[in-house]
């Protein structure tokens, strides 16, 4: 039994880091493998992560954590019953993949105007509460063509547009995500998509 | 009541050997790191050795490394400081002190925030 | 090693004055914000030491608000707002950031 790709992780920077390899050959990861990982520091101990089967020969393995600062580093060890197959670190700092956004709504009711809002993924105590900025993806369900993206800059979770930048009369989907500068980041999986039927009065054409 | 007692000390000739105990009770004991601290006769405070609550970890000060082995037995909510080849210059009361929570991933410190009342090791011809 | 020094090391205060400790490390004690790993504890006269403040700042349980601890990185200073007599006795600041851990050389308070 052997690593093929060695795992790589990457940290919410919150609870949980998430790491992901590859065997040689189709593997039971939970009964064949454990990841064993500990904090750089004093008196701490080693911690053990059960792995979950992602796909034939791949594993993935979800490591709990306390909360994360910038100084943390791990040492990770794969183990396969009494054989080490491979040794590692992680610093989860330098590897984050931020949370999805969630709660993503579409508010119809402002005048010819569309109020995109969602929920900050993380708590106010968090660093990365205030370092999010996000992209907003809205596309029509009829038209492919008919896709775009809003970069939001500033740190309200929202996003206003006219209502006319869009087609009239058909439906469209938006979903969010998020990345932190700060870190320089990955970007977070996309939000749940939320659907809505965007209509609005036409200006009234004068001749 | 979250209490430590340590046992053990005594008067020992210099090359001897001492087992220092340290009863734990009123809390996880399992789930802490302990540590022992000395203080010779009219003398600051002294760090001797600390251990993780599993027991897969130790520490020691440079001045007993190699004569003194930290231990610590979680079914009787112990721990042990055994003390072999002595000097003089470890005369000392011999403190026993609740470290941190090591069962968390980064392990969670609140200080040494529990103390034994102290046992006298004298070592002496 | 880190080298921790407090001063003065002799301290006489008249009651319902205030006082001060301070504490001084040779390397920064500061793992992350809010990780700040310098200790105070009291340690009267025949008995064990007592923690007073854990993490530079924070008072241990059943301390009396009249202590407080502040700094990080490498200054840390104790402050007691209004002595009273049953604080005599001798203040240790220790680090517990990496073994060793290692204490100031004590500062007796006495009252005056």
């Known amino acids: 039994m052997k690593v093929l790709q060695e795992p790589t992780c990457v940290s919410d920077y919150m609870s949980i880091s998430t790491c992901e390899w590859k065997m040689n050959g189709p593997t039971n990861c939970s009964t064949e493998l454990r990841l064993l990982y500990q904090l750089v520091f004093l008196l701490s101990e080693a911690h053990t992560c059960i792995p979950e089967n992602n796909g034939g020969a791949g594993c993935v393995c979800h490591l709990l954590m306390d909360d994360v600062v910038s100084a943390d580093n791990y040492t990770l060890d794969l183990w396969a019953g009494q054989q080490l197959l491979w040794k590692g670190s992680f610093k989860p700092s330098e590897h984050v993949k931020p949370r999805a956004p969630g709660n993503l709504t579409v508010h119809t009711n402002v005048s010819d105007t569309l109020l995109l809002t969602w929920s900050n993924p993380y708590p106010p105590d968090n660093y990365l509460y205030n370092h999010l900025t996000y992209a907003v993806n809205i596309w029509s369900e009829n038209d492919p063509a008919d896709f775009r993206i809003y970069n939001v800059t500033y740190l309200e979770p929202s996003l206003r547009i006219a209502a006319s930048t869009l087609k009239s009369g058909i439906s469209y989907r938006a979903r969010v995500r998020a990345w932190a500068q700060c870190y320089n980041t990955t970007w977070s999986e996309w939000s749940p998509s939320t659907k809505w039927h965007n209509s609005y009065r036409e200006p009234f054409e004068q001749h | 009541e979250v209490q430590l007692v340590e046992s053990g000390g005594g008067l020992e000739q210099p090359g001897g050997s001492l087992r220092l105990s340290c009863a734990g009770s009123?809390?996880?004991?399992?789930?802490?790191?302990m540590t022992w601290v000395r203080q010779a006769p009219g003398k600051g405070l002294e760090w001797v050795s600390s251990?993780?609550?599993?027991?897969?970890?130790?520490y020691y000060a440079d001045s007993v490394k190699g004569r003194f082995t930290i231990s610590r037995d979680n079914s009787k909510n112990t721990l042990y400081l055994q003390m072999n080849s002595l000097r003089a210059e470890d005369t000392a009361v011999y403190y026993c002190a609740k470290d941190r929570l090591t069962i968390a991933i980064r392990p969670y410190y609140y200080g040494l925030d529990v103390w034994g009342q102290g046992t006298t090791v004298t070592v002496s011809s | 090693d880190i080298v921790m020094t407090q001063s003065p090391l002799s301290l006489p205060v008249t009651p319902g004055e205030p006082a001060s400790i301070s504490c001084r490390s040779s390397q920064s004690l500061d793992y992350s914000i809010g990780y700040n790993y310098l200790d105070w504890y009291l340690q009267k006269s025949g008995q064990s030491p007592q923690l007073l403040i854990y993490l530079a700042s924070n008072r241990a349980s059943g301390v009396p608000d009249r202590f407080s601890g502040s700094g990080s990185g490498t200054d840390f200073t104790l402050k007691i707002s209004r002595v009273e007599a049953e604080d005599v006795g001798f203040y240790y600041c220790?680090?517990?950031?990496?073994?060793?851990?290692?204490f100031g050389q004590g500062t007796k308070l006495e009252i005056k």
């Open positions: 220790m680090q517990a950031l990496q073994t060793p851990y290692t």
């Open positions: 251990i993780s609550g599993s027991g897969s970890n130790t």
């Open positions: 009123g809390f996880t004991f399992s789930d802490y790191a």
